[in-house]
Amino acid sequence: PRGTQAEESPFVGNPGNITGARGLTGTLRCQLQVQGEPPEVHWLRDGQILELADSTQTQVPLGEDEQDDWIVVSQLRITSLQLSDTGQYQCLVFLGHQTFVSQPGYVGLEGLPYFLEEPEDRTVAANTPFNLSCQAQGPPEPVDLLWLQDAVPLATAPGHGPQRSLHVPGLNKTSSFSCEAHNAKGVTTSRTATITVLPQQPRNLHLVSRQPTELEVAWTPGLSGIYPLTHCTLQAVLSDDGMGIQAGEPDPPEEPLTSQASVPPHQLRLGSLHPHTPYHIRVACTSSQGPSSWTHWLPVETPEGVPLGPPENISATRNGSQAFVHWQEPRAPLQGTLLGYRLAYQGQDTPEVLMDIGLRQEVTLELQGDGSVSNLTVCVAAYTAAGDGPWSLPVPLEAWRPGQAQPVHQLVKEPSTPAFSWPWW
């Protein structure tokens, strides 16, 4: 019976050859004639069984008895031909204790070049070098590349210019790049990549001047190509020791205070800040093409200011040769660290006396003489490292009588012009 002798192959039709371009759909076919129950036909590519082959098997009996001959046809469908599909194809059957393999057929790929890598859209800073990539393959090989910038070839002929990687030393305008792949079958053109030219990161961000509630900063703009800068954006964020904004950290830990500066000048006054407070600032500049990258975070600090108001609720009472004065901390912002209080007192015909009380909020004055100094008045001011705040209005010294509450003088807060001024001492 057919198929039982080793030298006699059951195959009556072997796979043909297919050569085509990528994406082609084709079919390989083999046919065998066997006696008895038809075997399952396996497909080999380069000697390896294809486990997940898209194959169909058709069996036609040549007689009415199961033991008669059968014609078996197996078809292997190749959809969308790829390089990985190429190779030598054979059919394989197991008959009894023997294995039979058909004559080989060949699948080849030959057509227009195929892109493995194409240039991608990206943004670059003006006048900054960058690389673009393009890679194509056949067969047929060789494949030569030709780069185009704004549709203009960058070499006289394919294969004469840069190949897989194009180094661009810098751009001053937004441009398009593509590459052509050439082989014996023709030309394929890649996608067109748009390279958007953004302004360079500003440089030299630095502090120009400082006030307790404002900082003036300046920077040097980077190149922006043919596109003028439209504005620069400055961000400021309160900084804590535990916050961890370091030299290169990209994102602020909280919502920043954002200000826009028209340019030029490349300078901005940041107002409404807290006195004696550390901040971090950064800047980016924008053209019609988009914003530059941010500078690093720059640590800055507003200086201390003087207290904005005088001490509150000053009372001054006299008992014989002693005067007792006490007060409360200013309600107005201190604008820094309170270092203490200065107190000044003066009689009608006596020189003024200035005292540094420190952080206490009361003092007992020893009055000279018999206590008959007339019209004694007292003023108090709070001070920080930046200097003295406004002096309180003069408070007259009231005689104290046992059983009476000490008089308290509620002060007018923050007078626009002092009603009482002391010479500089």
């Epitope: 630095h206 120009v208 400082r210 370091q246």
Partner: antibody, heavy 119, light 112 residues
């Protein structure tokens, strides 16, 4: 554009005072920055001498503290160096420079004035 | 005060080759804010010093990117990747972490 232009005598007698002027254009010296004096000795060594701040405060190198004074005239947008009791050791090229407020980086410099102390 | 020491005192380089200049500080110039307060100046023949690099590695405006600065808290390097004729002069490192500001002794760059 910011420019610093220096002027002053190139020869000073020992024990006398050295006085130099730095005229600034393109930026008001009372609006910001530190306004520095630096000198360069004949052997190329650089020495920071001190600054006058935009707010009128001063800071001097301790090695010069008793002899140096930096003042300004905001109406003329100029600042000045005065170094008292000079000796031949003070022979140097003197530069004025603008310094950033944070950590004093000096970005614009004057052209330099060579001062010789000799009788 | 912080003492700055530069080496070598002079260096001779072929055009197009790279050059490195070293600088050492007597104390760390790394601030708690993460920045290192070391700068480099170039003084070209007959000119005033000009700022090249601030905060150890930041290029000042207009400075070509063939210049780069690196280092740790006390040891620093200025590298010029492709020396050009216009790079000749004396290079100074300096610290601006604290007053008084101090400078290195300078390194003279010459072309072979």
């Amino acid at each position: 554009q910011v420019q610093l232009v220096q002027s002053g005598p190139g020869l000073v007698k020992p024990s006398q005072s050295l006085s130099l002027t730095c005229a600034v254009t393109g930026f008001s010296i009372s609006s910001g920055y530190y306004w520095n004096w630096i000198r360069q000795f004949p052997g190329q060594k650089l020495e920071w001498m001190g600054y006058r701040s935009y707010d009128g405060s001063n800071n001097y190198n301790p090695s010069l503290k008793n002899r140096i004074s930096i003042t300004r005239d905001t109406s003329k947008n100029q600042f000045f160096l005065k170094l008292n009791s000079v000796t031949s050791e003070d022979t140097a090229t003197y530069y004025c420079a603008r310094g950033w407020l944070l950590h004093y980086t000096m970005d614009y410099w004057g052209q330099g004035t060579t001062v010789t102390v000799s009788s | 005060e912080i003492v700055m020491t530069q080496s070598p005192s002079s260096v001779s380089v072929t055009l197009g080759q790279s050059a490195s200049i070293s600088c050492r500080s007597s104390r760390s110039l790394l601030h708690s804010n993460g920045f290192t307060y070391l700068y480099w100046y170039l003084q070209k023949p007959g000119q005033s010093p000009q700022l090249l690099i601030y905060q150890m590695s930041n290029l000042a405006s207009g400075v070509p990117d063939r210049f780069s600065g690196s280092g740790s808290g006390t040891d620093f390097t200025l590298k010029i990747s492709r020396v050009e004729a216009e790079d000749v002069g004396v290079y100074y490192c300096g610290q601006n972490l604290e007053l008084p500001l101090t400078f290195g002794g300078g390194t003279k760059l010459e072309i072979k």
